[in-house]
Amino acid sequence: AILGRSETQECLFFNANWEKDRTNQTGVEPCYGDKDKRRHCFATWKNISGSIEIVKQGCWLDDINCYDRTDCVEKKDSPEVYFCCCEGNMCNEKFSYFPEMEVTQPTSNPVTPKPPYYN
């Protein structure tokens, strides 16, 4: 393991596909992948009238957009389906939406609001 990197070996698993088929597929997913590739966890969800509906959670494989992210945070502004990924065991247990605002006029005292967390 490279110093400072969180190795991902397992992730929280949920799959709405399986839920609707009444097979109760939730649990902990072991992440497998090529030796030279990095492994991540992810969460994807929808916000339907303020209600969070999880679509899937589990392992995600070697995506540069997930490198060195310890928290699962969606930064896109108002996506149709929210997605975040992270590194570290079970790091997708909690996920959040924290859009990166386009800053047109910098303020003298920028404030970073705390992202809303879901779990």
Epitope: N17, Q25, Y32, C59, W60, E80, F83
Partner: antibody, heavy 120, light 107 residues
Amino acid sequence: QVQLVQSGAEVKKPGSSVKVSCKASGRHFGSLQISWVRQAPGQGLEWMGGIIPIYGTANYAQKFQGRVTITADESTSTAYMELSSLRSEDTAVYYCVKDLTWTNLGLDIWGQGTMVTVSS
Amino acid sequence: EIVMTQSPSSLSASVGDTVTITCRASQGVSRWLAWYQQKPGKAPRLLIYGANMLRSGVPSRFSGSGSGTHFTLTISSLQPEDFATYFCQQSYSTPFTFGPGTKLEIK
């Protein structure tokens, strides 16, 4: 690296059943996501269903519900697909496939395929 | 059921060309889209997963893009071994469905 080896070709009569096996070599069989996909001669690909052996329960495409049974035996690292009430349109190559992840990111390792011919 | 369509259904190209194949989903599938290559008498081979991630061992001339309902597979600098049939597949919602395929032939 997982390898999937399937049972040999079958010729079946209409109305009968066929059971195709898929033996996995390598580690972690119980916690793999195994799917079954078929391809009729000269046609496209059709997902039939899948199973994670440690869970034991399978997920089926509605089209095959009631006619297909997917099972797995962890002790022998073997997955099975049984299709009943066979008809001529079930003539196809049947593949067992390992998925990259439990959430079905991509079908990355394929068996060699089993040709099932349904003919009277 | 999510219906996948591909265009074109076939195309002719020459070695060294760049080609693009399009796949559309009847409903949004987020990033749950994969691309496969199949040669006659062989099992399909995974090329791209997660819409744009290259499977280990697949040459970098293959690339995928898109999200939601519209996806593309691009093959740059075609090689003789690239002439085959290409399928897209969504695995966002069961039943997982494949596109009808695009046959890439030598001009």
